[in-house]
Interface confidence: medium
């Protein structure tokens, strides 16, 4: 007779989770040699220790310590790139620009990014079937509170000048409700992090707006300010070169402004 | 018993592509990574690139960056190295062979039998 | 890239002979190091994996030793279908590397 099983509003675990998380561990380890000494399977049993057998709406940062623990990995001053609503950009901009790195470039953001997981109370099972929604449901669900807990050490950790590249198409380019707003700017460190430095990425190829002016920027400056950090802004007016310019700086055509530059 | 058979030999204009299949039996394809090897005639072994089929994101020798594109269907079980922009030197035997940890690029311990591809006008 | 150099390029040795060959590595690989044996017209075979451990099947006279940049094959007593090509890989740094190979012919 099958066990009754909680509905919840959101999709279930994504299937092969635990194989899916072991072998991006292994290639993790294998790419990046100074992670070699990791343990995959230590970091799946810790990784599983967090959300099986945990009622899902009830998961805390606590329970995800013993995976960041075994997760620990610092990222090079002026080399951490934050973003939000704009994740795919983002990504391609650090698989160009080797040296920068997105939480998704580092073990733990690698190991979860696009999955869903979250186990049932008092059973060793993986609930496939539903998972919490962070609005419909509950909001300390396994992948939220995971996300949370990552994404405040990664800001924590970060120094020097930190970047954060946000989605000008949107209503409100910064969010104070994303993950981007609600953790991670406020746990930078203004005794390690100098500055703030905005890239905000054009959707439109005639838009010539100077998005740094736009009301949800000058909160995000003013937050910053308030924490002793310095803020600075760039319009990013064409991914698309933005990103070839990466690619290939030493071409004629990337000597011009490809962006426009605010200082405060 | 693990198989690893691979689409026959092929003869190819410089400038252009090549494709090469490598079909697994045996064992769980997802969870083993495939890597291709070449060895050009009378030389030495040259790892160009491997992929988890589950993953499905190859990595690539920067020797070869560019220019090969590694891929698996993970339905037939069925791995694919492309190798584009051919030149002489690229005749060799192309291997596919697969890793003998699950999830894991290496060492190979199973290994195709083998595709030779020539380069040649 | 981590560069694999094997040496001697080539041995030759009587049959029910020891055979030893080296490969060195332009930088520590821990213990992660293969050795593969290949025959003409044949694709390679995995002798040794780990830098000491013999993969399945393999007889008990092929023994690997070493770790870090320093790697020994040794064949403690020769037999006809031992004499082949033998190559060294390190699968600690990407992308993964083979040495060049050394021939192992009838004295």
């Known amino acids: 007779v099958p066990r009754w099983r909680q509905q919840w509003s959101g999709s279930g675990t994504t299937s092969r989770f635990p194989e899916t998380v072991l072998a991006r561990c292994v290639k993790y380890t294998e790419v990046h040699p100074e992670m070699r000494h990791v343990d995959c399977q230590s970091v799946w049993d810790a990784f599983k220790g967090a959300f099986i057998s945990k009622y899902p709406c009830n998961i805390t940062e606590e329970d995800y310590q013993p995976l960041v623990k075994l997760g620990t990995q610092t990222v090079p001053c002026n080399k951490t790139l934050l973003w939000s609503r704009i994740k795919d950009l983002a990504h391609q901009f650090t698989q160009v620009q080797r040296d920068m790195f997105t939480l998704e470039d580092m073990l733990l953001g690698y190991l979860a990014d696009d999955l869903t997981w979250c186990g049932e109370f008092n059973t060793f099972e993986i609930n496939y079937q539903s998972c919490p929604d962070w609005r419909k449901d509950c909001s300390n669900n396994p992948v939220s509170v995971f996300w949370k807990t990552v994404s405040r050490r990664f800001a924590e950790t970060a120094c020097g000048v930190v970047h954060v590249m946000l989605n000008g198409s949107r209503s409100k380019i910064f969010d104070k409700n994303s993950t981007f707003g609600s953790v991670e700017v406020h746990n930078l460190q203004p005794e390690k992090v100098q500055a703030l430095e905005a890239w905000v990425i054009h959707g439109g190829r005639e838009d010539s707006r100077d998005l740094c002016q736009d009301p949800t920027i000058k909160e995000l400056e003013s937050i910053i300010s308030k924490r002793n950090i310095r803020f600075f802004c760039k319009n990013i007016y064409r991914p698309d070169k933005f990103l070839q310019c990466v690619k290939n700086p030493e071409d004629s055509s990337c000597l011009s402004g490809i962006h426009h530059h605010h200082h405060h | 018993q693990v198989q690893l058979v691979q689409s026959g030999a092929e003869v190819k204009k410089p400038g252009s592509s090549v494709k090469v299949s490598c079909k697994a039996s045996g064992g769980d394809f997802s969870l083993y990574a495939i890597s291709w090897v070449r060895q050009a005639p009378g030389q030495g072994l040259e790892w160009m690139g491997g992929i988890i089929p589950l993953l499905g994101e190859p990595v690539y020798a920067q020797k070869f960056q560019g220019r090969v594109t590694i891929t698996a269907d993970e339905s037939t079980s069925t791995a694919y190295m492309e190798l584009s922009s051919l030149r002489s030197e690229d005749t060799a035997v192309y291997y596919c062979a697969r890793g003998h940890r699950v999830y894991s690029s290496s060492p190979f311990d199973y290994w195709g039998q083998g595709t030779l591809v020539t380069v040649s006008s | 890239e981590i560069v694999m150099t094997q040496s001697p390029a080539t041995l030759s040795v009587s049959p029910g002979e020891r055979a030893t060959l080296s490969c060195r590595a332009s930088q520590s690989v821990s213990s992660n190091l293969a050795w593969y044996q290949q025959k003409p017209g044949q694709a390679p075979r995995l002798l040794i994996y780990g830098a000491s451990t013999r993969a399945t099947g393999i007889p008990a006279r092929f023994s690997g030793s070493g770790s870090g940049t320093e790697f020994t094959l040794t064949i403690s007593s020769l037999q006809s279908e031992d004499f082949a090509v033998y190559y060294c890989?390190?699968?600690?740094?990407?992308?993964?590397?083979f040495g060049q190979g050394t021939k192992v012919e009838i004295k």
């Open positions: 890989q390190q699968y600690n740094n990407w992308p993964w590397t």
